[in-house]
Each structure stands twice: as C-alpha cells, then as structure tokens.
C-alpha cells in the first residue's frame, strides 16, 4: 500500500536551467513562477514549450501526479477534450498511440507522463496562445484534465511552467496559507523577468527522467457533462486551430481503436498515424496503490497476457492492473 507523502511535488522535473543568465539567477525565478501558477497542486500538470530552433514547433509535456494506473491519455488543443477541443493524440498504455496532424510525435516519457511534439505550417500550425489540454483517465476513480499555453511574451526556448486548468478546483486553504510567500515571490519574479527581457534566452535541455512524489488529496475531475461543479473556462483561444486534420501519416494501426468509447477520444476524420510504443519502466514513482502490491512505493508493472488480474478479462483494459486501480 502507498504511504502518504507529506509534501506533494508542485511541479514536474524542469529541464536544465543553465544559460546566459547563469544557474543561480534562473532557478529561483523559475521555481517562483511555477509556484505562482500551480498553487493548489492539481493532479495533472501541463507544460508547453516552443523550440528555440524551430519556432513553429511546440513540445507539450503532461503528467499525472495522482494515484492509480493510467487507462488513457488524451491531448487536445483549443480547449478541454469534449468541450470544444480538438484531439491531437490518444495514448493507451497497452493498445498504443494514435495521433493526428499537426502532432508529429507522441510518446510516453514515464508510466505517468507523456510528451507530444507539434509542428506545422499554415492552417495546421499552432501558435503561442493556443491552449493545450491533457486528460488522464484512471479507472475506477475517474478522469483529470489540465490545460496550459505559452505565455504571450514567451521567448523561444523557454517552456511554460506546469499549468493547472481553471476548471480544476484550487485548495483555498493551501493557497491562503502560502499567499504571502507567493505574493512576494511573484513580485520578485516580475522584477527579474523585466531585467531578463532583453537578454538572450537560455537553451533548455529536456529532462528524460520524471521522478514524482505522491500526491496529496483529491481534485474534482474535469467533466464537460458535470460543468455545474466547476469554474467555467474564462479564455479559450481558437484562432490557431487547424481548419482540418487530414494530413496525418497514412499508416494503419492496431485494431484496438474501434473498441475505444467514441466519447473518450472524439475521433477526428482522416487516417491516423500510429506508434506502438511501450512505456518505459518508471524510476521512482511511489504513489500507486492496489491490493496486490503491499510495499509502499511499488507500482504494478504493465504485464502481458500471461498474468490475468481480473476474473473476467473480456477486453484489453482488463489486463492493466488489479481491480481497484486499472
């Protein structure tokens, strides 16, 4: 069984922060910026980054900080999946990955985080104020979604810090408790950012490992159908969404797609590009819990058909984990 972590991680591992400003100068504002944006620590983080080398290329990284095996990840843009957003990629731990243009490469970074590279020109090209959303589904306890976008003044090569969606409830007590520190930090951060405005941007090296601490308590799932429970979206930019998504690579894919609930993916028209990428083994994720793994910090492996964990495995999802956490 999972042991509760006393201090949940506020952010995913950041890319290396070496550059023109120097390590010491950059780390503090970066940490402060992350704190300012992620107060309340929802279950999902989203990080959007524009590549310094290719200005039309974006990298979206998303991670699930909650407990439970991930059943499905959906990445969309233009708003939350199922609420006006257009699906860019769907990643299933065992059935594979499906993506649509302008998504170039979707992949699992760890068993609880994914990355998606977008590139394009013209109608299919994302732009700086596009909203990107990631939805993580985990049976039987539900779905969580968060959204993020590049700040309008982002320099190429700088990534937007993990951004919780406004539809996720903030822990008001937690926010109030650290508000003084955050207020000071944010003011200091703005001061540093102003100073940094005309300096060359540092090159950030993406981290390939994602150790994550177990999460604290619960957050409301993002459900379009349960909109009454959540703060409505304030700003969703749609000006950069493509007119069509018909430029995906014409590869056939595994047959599992047909068995996905159609509402889970909001399938766009056109052929799909597939990659059956296995998930890399996790390094130090310790927040999963289920009936078969008694030691704190253990996560069930993604097993093959040889290990039947359900009494009635009539579908592919049945092999993903024990009953309490699929």
């Amino acid at each position: 069984m999972r042991t509760e972590a006393q201090v949940p991680a506020l952010q995913p591992p950041e890319p290396g922060l070496e550059g023109a400003m120097g390590h010491r100068t950059l780390v503090l504002p970066w940490v402060l910026l992350t704190l300012c944006v992620t107060a309340g620590t929802p279950e999902v983080w989203v990080q959007v980054r524009m590549e310094a080398t290719e200005l039309s290329s974006f990298t979206i990284r998303c991670g699930f900080l909650g407990s439970g095996s991930i059943s499905l990840v959906t990445v969309s843009w233009g708003g939350p999946n199922g609420a006006g957003g257009t699906t860019l990629a769907v990643l299933h731990p065992e059935r594979g990955i499906r993506q649509w243009a302008p998504a170039r490469q979707a992949r699992w970074e760890t068993q609880s985080s994914i990355s998606l590279i977008l590139e394009g020109s013209g109608a299919s090209s994302p732009c700086a104020n596009t909203t990107f959303c990631c939805k993580f589904a985990s049976f039987p306890e539900g779905s969580w979604e968060a959204c993020g976008s590049l700040p309008p003044s982002s320099d190429p090569g700088l990534s937007a810090p993990p951004t919780p969606a406004p539809i996720l409830r903030a822990d008001l007590a937690g926010i109030l408790g650290v508000s003084g520190v955050l207020l000071f930090g944010c003011v200091y951060l703005l001061h540093l950012l102003r100073r940094h405005k005309h300096r060359p941007a540092p090159r950030l090296q993406p981290s390939r490992t994602s150790p994550q601490a177990p999460r604290a308590r619960a957050w409301a799932p993002s459900q379009a159908s349960q909109a009454a429970l959540h703060v409505p979206y304030a700003t969703i930019n749609t000006s950069c969404r493509p007119a069509t998504l018909d430029t995906a690579h014409p590869h056939g894919g595994p047959s599992w797609w047909a068995s996905l609930p159609t509402h889970a993916a909001h399938r766009p028209q056109g052929p799909a590009a597939w990659a059956s990428t296995p998930i890399p083994a996790r390094g130090s994720f310790v927040s999963v819990e289920n009936g078969l793994y008694a030691q704190a910090g253990e996560r069930p492996p993604h097993t093959g058909p040889g290990l039947t964990l359900f009494p009635d495995p009539r579908g592919p999802r049945a092999m993903e984990g024990p009953l309490g956490v699929r």
Epitope: S67, S71, G142, E289, R314, G315
Partner: antibody
Framework: EVKLVESGGGLVKPGGSLKVSCAAS????????MSWVRQTPDKRLEWVAC???????YYPDSVKGRFTISRDNGRNIVNLQMSSLRSEDAAMYYC?????????????WGQGTLVTVSA | ENVLTQFPAIMSVFLGERVTMSCRAS?????MYWYQQKSDASPKLWIY???NLAPGVPARFSGSGSGNSYSLTISSMEGEDAATYYC?????????FGGGTKLEIK
C-alpha cells in the same frame, strides 16, 4: 433525468438462481460503468459487481463465480444473474451508475429490488 | 480487504450544532466517497474524491482526510441532514463501505 429501475427480485431457496435487471434511461447508457450494490437487512452496504464501458467485469470474492453481471447497450439494461444463492445473499439490490466513463463510483442509484433467500 | 470503520455509529445532535463523523480505513486509500441514505430511500452520492460535494449537496457539508483517516463535517446541523452516512473506498478490491453513522436530531 437519470432513471434506474430495478426488477426481478423475489423469494428463492438456498442454492437457487435468480436474475435481477436494471432498466436505465435519461443518459447515454453505453458511456457509463454500471454496478450492483446490495444492502443487507442490518443496513450494511456491499458492492456486488461492476461492468465498465468495455464490458470488463469486476466482482468481490464473496460472489465471484456465482454472480454474473452483463449489459445490453441496445436495450439500456444491466443484468445480474445470481446462482448458488446463500442466505447471506438476501438483501435489497441496487443498480448504480458511475460518474463518467472511467469513474465507477456510484453517482446515481435505483430504488432497489428485494431478494429473499429462505428455505 | 480494506475494512472501513465509521464512528460514532450513532450521533444525536442539536440543530445548529457542528457535526463531525469519521471513517478509518485499515489500509491507506487514495480518495474517500460518502453517501447519504434516509430511511426507506436509496443511498445518494454526497461527497466524492474526499472533499468534493455532489450536485445539490448544501455547502454546509465538507469532507477531508488522507491516508487512513477521513471525516465528513456539517458546519451547522439542519433537520434535513438527519440520515445515515456511509463512507466508501475504490482504491483496492473489493470496493468496501463503512458500517455507517446514523445522525439523529436531539
């Protein structure tokens, strides 16, 4: 409006079989996991079975091998076939709908159907 | 099996009084769910994901907790709150319920 109506309860002898059904309306039935929960005469609640949107099924050990949950998405019905019934299976059986496609927790409940197991 | 123990089993409180009932799990759980049941009625989802109120639940209700210990609180008891409250977990199989706390008006 979400509506769940159970039927099929009744008196059955120990070792006998019974099928209870739940007719659902007011929502897209195939989009939600469905469960059966029972309440014993001493008012204790016990989860009995769940079927998800992919028709994977889940049971506690206490009913595994004896109870079978199934769904008919065309007719918006979820069934619970019970066999080898024991006295401890006597209860009010509730049909419950999940919150969304991946959230099995019991967001909506029917009015229940009473199953009595007695010689 | 993760055994959920609710206490007290019965509470008698005055109207306007603050009420807190507890649910302890034999093993740590990720989230706790609470249901309200009035006599001769079906249970209703009351709190999900530990602290989120289901639609229609009055704001005087709140939920909290982590690990093995969870609680449901009513800031000011009202007559319509008299009912039995059950906690439940989905973290491990089988999904289990607590024995219930019956809340009565004194």
């Amino acid at each position: 409006e979400v509506k769940l109506v159970e039927s099929g309860g009744g008196l059955v002898k120990p070792g006998g079989s019974l099928k209870v059904s739940c007719a659902a309306s007011g929502f897209t039935f195939s989009d939600y996991p469905m469960s059966w929960v029972r309440q014993t005469p001493d008012k204790r609640l016990e989860w009995v079975a769940c079927i998800d949107t992919d028709e994977n099924t889940y049971y506690p050990d206490s009913v595994k091998g004896r109870f079978t949950i199934s769904r008919d998405n065309g007719r918006n019905i979820v069934n619970l076939q019970m066999s080898s019934l024991r006295s401890e299976d006597a209860a009010m059986y509730y049909c419950a709908r999940g919150w969304d496609d991946y959230a099995a927790w019991f967001a909506y409940w029917g009015q229940g159907t009473l199953v009595t197991v007695s010689a | 099996e993760n055994v959920l123990t609710q206490f007290p089993a019965i509470m008698s409180v005055f109207l306007g009084e603050r009420v807190t009932m507890s649910c302890r799990a034999s093993s740590s759980v990720n989230y706790m769910y609470w249901y309200q049941q009035k006599s001769d009625a079906s249970p209703k989802l009351w709190i999900y994901h530990t602290s989120n109120l289901a639609p229609g639940v009055p704001a005087r209700f709140s939920g909290s907790g982590s690990g093995n210990s969870y609680s449901l609180t009513i800031s000011s008891m009202e007559g319509e709150d008299a009912a039995t409250y059950y906690c439940q977990q989905f973290t491990s199989s089988p999904w289990t319920f607590g024995g219930g706390t019956k809340l009565e008006i004194k």
